[in-house]
């Protein structure tokens, strides 16, 4: 959707900095868009010597870089902060790093949780 009618999507939500930023720490985020605007899910993380540190997850505003991506795949070679975005409910639950320049694909599976809906 996102063409002519408002779009609603649900994404996994997480904020590692939730105390300082006065937000919820984790749950589900329901994204409700404007007419003719797409909404996406995103994930961002750091990779410190193979240790994955989740930074943020949630809804992401209309962004052509995210169009028609069913999976959350970061393609930058070696950023300080990895970022991926995708279209589809909860598509940011799993996220992958697959650098455009080639190299091993690394997929991150979330630990099992019982998420709560953010309001």
């Amino acid at each position: 959707s996102g063409r002519g009618e408002a779009e609603t999507r649900e994404c996994i939500y997480y904020n590692a900095n939730w105390e300082l930023e006065r937000t919820n720490q984790s749950g589900l985020e329901r994204c409700e868009g404007e007419q003719d605007k797409r909404l996406h899910c995103y994930a961002s993380w750091r990779n410190s010597s193979g240790t994955i540190e989740l930074v943020k997850k949630g809804c992401w505003l209309d962004d052509f870089n995210c169009y028609d991506r069913q999976e959350c795949v970061a393609t930058e070679e070696n950023p300080q902060v990895y970022f991926c975005c995708c279209e589809g409910n909860f598509c940011n639950e799993r996220f992958t790093h697959l650098p455009e320049a080639g190299g091993p694909e690394v997929t991150y599976e979330p630990p099992p949780t019982a998420p709560t809906l953010l309001t």
């Epitope: 930023e21 006065r22 961002s44 809804c59 505003l61 950023p79 902060v81």
Partner: antibody, heavy 120, light 107 residues
Framework: QVQLVQSGAEVKKPGASVKVSCKAS????????MHWVRQAPGQGLEWMGW????????NYAQKFQGRVTMTRDTSISTAYMELSRLRSDDTAVYYC?????????????WGQGTTVTVSS | DIQMTQSPSSVSASVGDRVTITCRAS??????LAWYQQKPGKAPKLLIY???SLQSGVPSRFSGSGSGTDFTLTISSLQPEDFATYYC?????????FGGGTKVEIK
Amino acid sequence: QVQLVQSGAEVKKPGASVKVSCKASGYTFTGHKMHWVRQAPGQGLEWMGWINPASGWTNYAQKFQGRVTMTRDTSISTAYMELSRLRSDDTAVYYCARVSMYAPEPMDVWGQGTTVTVSS
Amino acid sequence: DIQMTQSPSSVSASVGDRVTITCRASQGISRWLAWYQQKPGKAPKLLIYAASSLQSGVPSRFSGSGSGTDFTLTISSLQPEDFATYYCQQAFSHPWTFGGGTKVEIK
């Protein structure tokens, strides 16, 4: 249309307090955080903090901690920013700005600004 | 705090010129970057969010690029109404911070 209308210019003496209002219209007031940004004469933009109108939660820049208070009245869709113990270097234009509901949270609608002059 | 450094601080250009402004973050902010335009006596106006997404109603001659620490705002063909000051701003981590601004002046 979506609009933020701020209160008028203020002249204050050092040590006094000022309270600036920002009335929202054209959207659901409780659906978007409201940020405050100031700009001293001839200077750049300085972020002061935000209030979540739905919860009343606030987040202030460390520089203003203890001097700034952000509040809201949801019944009239209005946010307020009060700055106390004013000094001459608080002379600035103060803006309220709505942020988009979702990441990366750009400030997509701004008030027209309120000029606050601190002078003895 | 994340420092945002803009360059140049001012640029003189003519109508029709291509103008490029850069913004560097002191640490990685992924794509949590916005660009604003401000004219004298007016409030800032959002141009670009998420580093490269054009805000509704903003002319397509404005474009943004970059990710991580280095970002660019480009005006492909400068128009008379584009003479203004431009600010970058990061929203990746609190406190949110702005660049010092770039004034685009008439040559």
